[in-house]
């Protein structure tokens, strides 16, 4: 377990001709806040699968108002860092997106309250416990500098949050096979639960399951006596044949390398693999420029004659990222409906349908309420060929299984107030607005409308109304 | 984002009926709560019938009973249906939506409906 936290340092206008024009003005005055959304590995993630390693919303940032004629300077930011709390291993590589969203403060007048200004989106390679990685990206005339990190949580070490620590239980060392927990230095690593039958004395684990041998020992469960002669290497894991490990640090302990490096181990020392726009030893220069080729996929490098300027690359069609990096994926719209699979043809989009469903993006449910089950007093509706449960008070969900508060999903617009009734839930609206869910003004250009909440906050934030 | 286009809009004679329909640019309506709004030259726009995400409908009182709303969940569309037209009728007639995922509302650009001998 552990933290993932993102510092925004600064949103503005990038370099290069066409600044963007203020999000804001005196007429209608705004703050910004952020949302970062995280998925595991570095492949796309699957559609429905979206934000799998977790989310996270900003505080709002304060108020601003565009002075007239003035360029649209950095923006003001909110205070303090989003986090994102990992339950399990963090997995070292990640997918991560982050929006810039700005709040509307004057009347609102049809129109949205919530308007999203940006969105950068990248992928990384990370170890827990190394230090601030920093990062610039561009989404148009935009750019979004930050930096992130990703901790493990106590008791939890290394850089998967994988091993756990616990106090020592002697003063001076700890037990067969465990180290030191850096930089916990006077707690020691907890065993982890191993193979079954993997030997408490000779044997020990990093990773639930496994078994791996001190020195001296061999075979699946670290009971077979080796010669010491047999070791080929001074450092490294056991393994049947050699059953060599020397504990203690390895070059790659605490992660060397920068700014999101990549560590691996070579025979004399470490070596790191570094994300582009950084360079050296531990990937702790920066500045890139038109010379280095950083636009990819035919990009187009405009500026950064020296390493102090920035560089901008034009994208061919079909391709977007700061460095012409990504495929533009229209997929990440989630066109595809009931789980179906999407796929980026190029020339077209395709849904590929799970069992069950079918038509251009799988809107069509094939069954019918005939062979349908809602569960807890929910009854079958069709309509359209799809079909769907609706669900008694206080369950929800596809089949009705789940328990649900009618008001947990902020079922009433516009400010309206949820009441749980024994029939059902009821919106009261505020004046000006009609609808089940008053979801209606009666006359929108005159309507002083509460903003709806965005993407991300939970039901009950204090924050979902101004 | 969601885009609304309107159709069905022109003169007809008092008494007479109309369809409007409204093509909504997503995969299901399912996700929209739907109206028709219009504005008269040199009034307010109103309300003049919605209907829900769940199906049930509201209507402005000087159309009860004359005008119905409904939707084809299938085609992703919404229809107005008009009937015994009158002169005080005649307005731009505007699609609305009101999403349920992004929060937001959006608008049609409108169609003209005139009611006139």
């Known amino acids: 377990a552990g933290v993932f936290e993102l510092q925004i340092h600064s949103f503005g206008p990038g370099p290069g001709p066409g600044a963007p024009r203020s999000p804001c003005s005196a007429r209608l005055p705004c703050r910004l806040f952020f949302r970062v959304c995280l998925k595991p590995g570095l492949s796309e993630e699957a559609a429905e699968s979206p934000c799998a390693l977790g989310a996270a919303l900003s505080a709002r940032g304060p108020v601003y108002t565009e002075q007239p004629g003035a360029p649209a300077p950095d923006l003001p930011l909110p205070d303090g860092l989003l986090q994102v709390p990992f339950r399990d291993a963090w997995p070292g590589t990640f997918s991560f997106i982050i929006e810039t969203w700005r709040e509307e403060l004057g009347d609102q007048i049809g129109g949205p309250a919530w308007s999203l200004l940006a969105r950068v989106a990248g992928r990384r390679r990370l170890a827990a416990g190394g230090p601030w990685a920093r990062d610039i990206q561009r989404a148009g005339a935009w750019e979004l500098r930050f930096s992130y990190r990703a901790r493990c949580e106590p008791p939890a070490v290394g850089t998967a949050c994988t091993r756990l620590c616990r106090p020592r239980s002697a003063p001076s060392r700890c037990g067969p096979g465990l180290r030191p927990c850096a930089p916990l230095e006077d707690e020691c690593e907890a065993p982890l639960v191993c193979r079954a039958g993997c030997s408490p004395e000779h044997g020990f684990c990093e990773q639930p399951g496994e078994c791996r041998c001190l020195e001296g020992w061999t075979g699946p469960l670290c009971t077979v006596p080796v010669s010491t002669s047999s070791c080929l290497s001074p450092r490294g894991p056991s393994s049947a044949t050699t059953g060599c490990l020397v504990p203690g640090p390895g070059p790659c302990d605490g992660n060397p390398c920068a700014n999101g490096g990549s560590c691996s181990e070579t025979p004399r020392s470490f070596e790191c693999t570094c994300p582009r726009g950084f360079y050296g030893l531990r990937c702790e220069v920066s500045g890139v420029t038109c010379a280095d080729g950083p636009c990819f996929n035919g990009g187009l490098c405009v500026g950064g004659a020296d390493p102090d300027s920035a560089y901008i690359c034009h994208c061919p069609p079909g391709f977007q990222g700061s460095n012409c990096e990504k495929r533009v994926d229209r997929c990440s719209l989630q066109p595809c409906r009931n789980g179906g699979l999407c796929l980026d043809l190029g020339h077209a989009l395709r849904c590929r349908c799970r069992a069950g469903f079918a038509g251009p993006r799988c809107e069509h449910d094939l069954d019918d309420c005939a062979g349908r089950a809602c569960a807890n007093g929910g009854t079958c509706v069709e309509g359209g060929g799809a079909h769907r449960c609706s669900c008694a008070l206080g369950f929800g969900g596809r089949d009705c299984r789940e328990r649900a508060d009618p008001c947990a999903a902020r079922p009433c617009a516009h400010g309206g107030r949820c009441y749980a009734h024994f029939s059902g839930l009821v919106c009261a609206c505020a004046p000006g607005y009609m609808g089940a869910r008053c979801e209606f003004p009666v006359h929108p250009d005159g309507a002083s409308a509460l903003p709806a909440a965005p993407p991300g906050l939970r039901p009950g934030d204090p924050q979902r109304y101004l | 984002e969601v885009q609304l286009v309107e159709s069905g809009g022109g003169l007809v004679q008092p008494g007479g009926s109309l369809t409007l329909s409204c093509a909504a640019s997503?995969?299901?309506?399912?996700?929209?709560?739907t109206a028709w709004y219009r504005q008269a030259p040199g009034k307010k726009r109103e309300l003049v019938a919605g209907?829900?995400?769940?199906?049930?409908?509201v209507y402005f009182d000087s159309v009860k009973g004359r005008f119905t709303i409904s939707r084809d969940n299938a085609k992703n569309s919404v229809y107005l249906q008009m009937n015994s037209l009158r002169a005080e009728d005649t307005a731009v007639y505007y699609c609305?939506?009101?999403?349920?995922?992004?929060?937001?509302?959006?608008w049609g650009q409108g169609t003209l409906v005139t009611v006139s001998s």
């Open positions: 997503v995969y299901s309506v399912y996700d929209l709560s």
């Open positions: 209907i829900s995400d769940d199906g049930s409908t």
């Open positions: 609305y939506a009101y999403s349920w995922i992004t929060r937001s509302p959006y």
